[in-house]
């Protein structure tokens, strides 16, 4: 081998050792969620900084990941810190700065008090009530801490309380009280004035427990103007379009992962159905039509059966005389007897039945039983947004499903159309067979997101029972990320913009509220939140 080639080969080997490459090919349909994993850290050392870049451009995202069980969401409400499966250790003071961690421009973010932890965190002592003042039942057994300029300070509650302040939620809009196991979203500043572009750094301060290492993030000018989720080493791009195709490179220390993303485009009608929950109108209309047609078919069927019975009775009547007739040419019933009703042929109804079932199945089947996990885990959709006004507590954000068609998405019904169409099995060829058709294409779901029957609808969390419930297993981003955030960002707004709904301080599931929260997700054009009085849009907590 000539020396220059040998040298080049050795150089290649050396570079290969310094910067091992992992090549991934990801192919997906337009509208599905792209999950881009970065190579894992070496098990020892500190978590390395991640740098994501695209094609031949410079980095678009730089991230110091922080502890496990944390994530970042980049979207219309700015950059949000996500804390999954909140535990007592995660209570405390959350500070942030629109700067890298090395700078000293920290500002108060949010306090998080975890129910039952025995600790209460407030930015201001005044939010605990007057001197010696308790805050309802909780504070009698809780040690309050207040922020004293640059550190937490134990607050001594005196024996007397001059002016009781009522319950826990009557505190600063930057003070949150959440249930253990819930998921909390924190903005840096109150939206819409929260940090939206980066850099942004987060810090957690607890007076008596080790502080959690929180992520810091920088979005550069090259950053795509789109929604993104960062869950540890995973970058998730929900609802990809053709513009998202290309090569993504993740550098982590001296490791590099190259991910080639290919997007297969869908027909224009698909976009129309997907756009801004536009599919609800045709689906509801279709369901209504199917219901009406089902009723009509049932009625005609019944009527026909009665007439047939009557005629059969008449024909078998021994007092009646039978005579042979020559059938007229044409489409009439090919019977040699006169008073005979044409019976349907074995296949006559199948095509139409399959079409109906397919059109319904396409809408309903992919959702499976969306509530199964929620019911297992408790009220997964409930918010823990403090200090909502009494009017807001009335719950205008949650409407009852007001028609059969609506509730079919939420209840564990069998396919109604299938039931209606196959009640008289004799009329159809294979009444037990599942209808084949558009539902096989998963036509109303986003790629694999709703593959499993027990997957939940609501982003950003899936398998609620696993990692949102207090007894859930540890959160594993690599396992969970695949089906995170499967709604479009327009749908997501429903979650964050829903009027703050105060969760009762008594723990307990609220299934109706859950079903409704899914309904709300599909209302992107609903009223924008009033960030003033409540001021909690930047945070959302599920139980």
């Amino acid at each position: 081998m000539p020396p220059p080639l040998l040298l080049a080969f050795l150089l290649f080997l050396t570079l290969g050792r310094v910067r091992p490459q992992k090549l991934l090919q990801v192919e997906m349909e337009e509208g599905s969620d792209a999950v881009l994993p970065c190579l894992q850290d070496p098990p020892d050392g500190p978590p390395e900084r991640l740098i994501w870049s695209r094609d031949s451009q410079g980095p678009f995202l730089e991230l110091s990941p922080g502890s496990p069980g944390l994530g970042i969401h980049v979207g219309r409400l700015g950059i949000l810190l996500l804390i999954f499966n909140v535990s007592n250790e995660m209570g405390g003071f959350y500070l942030c700065q629109p700067a890298p961690p090395s700078q000293q421009a920290w500002q108060p973010g949010w306090t998080v008090s975890v129910e039952g932890s025995g600790e209460l965190f407030r930015w201001n002592a005044s939010d605990l009530g007057g001197p010696g003042c308790g805050l309802g039942n909780e504070s009698s057994s809780s040690q309050p801490y207040v922020w004293d300029r640059d550190h937490p300070k134990e607050w001594d509650m005196g024996p007397a309380c001059a002016s009781p302040r009522g319950d826990l939620n009557q505190s600063s809009s930057l003070d949150l009280t959440v249930a253990p196991g819930s998921t909390v979203w924190l903005s840096c500043g109150v939206p819409p004035a929260s940090v939206a572009t980066g850099p942004v750094s987060w810090a957690h301060i607890h007076p008596t427990k080790p502080n959690i290492l929180l992520p810091s993030l920088n979005l550069t000018a090259e950053s795509p103007a789109r929604e993104m989720w960062v869950l540890g080493p995973v970058l998730m791009l929900p609802q990809v379009t053709a513009v998202d195709a290309g090569m993504y490179v993740c550098r982590r220390g001296n490791l590099t992962t190259e991910i080639h993303v290919t997007i297969t485009v869908r027909p224009a009608i698909w976009h129309w159905l997907q756009r801004k929950s536009g599919w609800i109108v045709p689906v509801v209309a279709l369901l209504y039509l199917i219901f009406c047609l089902g009723c009509l078919v049932s009625f005609l069927h019944l009527r026909r059966a009665l007439i047939l019975r009557r005629k059969r009775k008449r024909m078998t009547d021994p007092t009646r005389r039978f005579f042979k007739v020559t059938p007229p040419a044409g489409n009439g019933a090919q019977s040699q007897y006169g008073n005979v009703l044409s019976l349907p042929t074995p296949t006559s109804g199948t095509g139409r039945a399959q079409r109906w079932a397919a059109s319904l199945g396409g809408a309903a089947a992919p959702y499976g039983h969306p509530l199964s996990d929620v019911q297992e885990a408790g009220a997964a959709g409930s918010r823990s947004l403090p200090r909502a006004s009494p009017e807001e507590e009335e719950g205008e954000a949650y409407e009852e499903p007001d028609s059969e068609a609506d509730s079919e998405f939420y209840e564990n019904d069998s396919n109604p159309a299938q039931d209606q169409l196959s009640q008289d099995g004799s009329g159809y060829e294979n009444p037990e067979e599942e209808p084949s058709g558009p539902e096989d294409d998963d036509s109303f779901s986003n790629a694999e997101s709703y593959e499993n029957e027990d997957e939940e609808l609501a982003p950003p969390v899936t398998r609620t029972a696993d990692f949102l419930s207090p007894h859930g297993s540890a959160w594993d981003p690599s396992r969970e990320a695949v089906s995170l955030g499967s709604q479009s960002y327009e749908d997501m707004r429903g979650i964050l913009y829903a009027a703050p709904q105060l969760r009762s301080s008594r723990p307990g599931p609220s299934y109706e509220e859950d079903a409704d929260s899914y309904e709300n997700m599909d209302n992107p054009d609903g009223p924008e939140p009033a960030w003033g009085a409540g001021g909690h849009g930047g945070t959302w907590s599920t139980r």
Partner: antibody, heavy 122, light 107 residues
Framework: QVQLQQSGPEVVKPGASVRMSCKAS????????IHWMKQRPGQGLEWVGC????????NYNEKFKGKATLTADKSSSTAYLQLSSLTSEDSAVYFC???????????????WGQGTLVIVSA | DIVMTQSPATLSVTPGDRVSLSCRAS??????LHWYQQSSHESPRLLIK???QSISGIPSRFSGSGSGSDFTLTINSVEPEDVGVYYC?????????FGGGTNLEIK
């Protein structure tokens, strides 16, 4: 109560390196920065840099970049200052002090170690 | 870097005197100014934080004032044990910087 225990005096040759330690007790080591200060005989205090043991994030005074290296061992709650390529200019007492929380503007030092004397001599 | 200048360099006082030590920053540092006392062969001791906040365990005769770039440490009635060097520290931004010190002597 909070205590910072520094290692003993060091006499080293020019060009060599020295590593001194600061063992913390009485608080959660990973929650607070450890700062290092240099004081030459009969002179004032100079801030060398600081390290946050929670994420090993460190900040240096430009003057000491390349000279000082800060590390921390969470398991033993000990912070280290290593000085390389020593000259007589590095002869000084080095103090460690507990700083504030990562994420706060806490920039004052209520707790100090007793100091480690480093003498660079041929 | 922010330069901290202390004056006077040395101050000789009689016990019971009221003394003021001055510290000036080369740029505004709001109230991010802390005062320390260092006795001979000892570690520095925090006296005042954030220009005027007292520290528990520190005698009430020590008080601080000022904001922006001009600061003062006042000792109301000097005691013999107050001898030592007094340093002011910029805590506004990295790198933290200290003044050259004021050496307080008892006559």
């Amino acid at each position: 109560q909070v205590q910072l225990q520094q290692s003993g005096p060091e006499v080293v040759k020019p060009g060599a390196s020295v590593r001194m330690s600061c063992k913390a007790s009485g608080y959660i080591f990973t929650n607070h920065y450890i700062h290092w200060m240099k004081q030459r005989p009969g002179q004032g205090l100079e801030w060398v840099g600081c390290i946050y043991p929670g994420n090993v994030n460190s900040n240096y005074n430009e003057k000491f970049k390349g000279k000082a290296t800060l590390t921390a061992d969470k398991s033993s709650s000990t912070a280290y200052l290593q000085l390389s390529s020593l000259t007589s200019e590095d002869s000084a007492v080095y103090f460690c002090a507990r700083g504030g929380y990562y994420g706060s503007s806490y920039s004052w030092f209520a707790y100090w170690g007793q100091g480690t004397l480093v003498i660079v001599s041929a | 870097d922010i330069v901290m200048t202390q004056s006077p360099a040395t101050l000789s006082v009689t016990p019971g005197d009221r003394v003021s030590l001055s510290c000036r920053a080369s740029q505004s540092i709001s109230d991010f100014l802390h005062w320390y006392q260092q006795s001979s062969h000892e570690s520095p001791r925090l006296l005042i934080k954030y220009a005027s906040q007292s520290i528990s365990g520190i005698p009430s005769r020590f008080s601080g004032s000022g904001s922006g770039s001009d600061f003062t440490l006042t000792i109301n009635s000097v005691e013999p044990e107050d001898v030592g060097v007094y340093y002011c520290q910029n805590g506004h931004s990295f790198p933290y910087t200290f003044g050259g010190g004021t050496n307080l002597e008892i006559k």
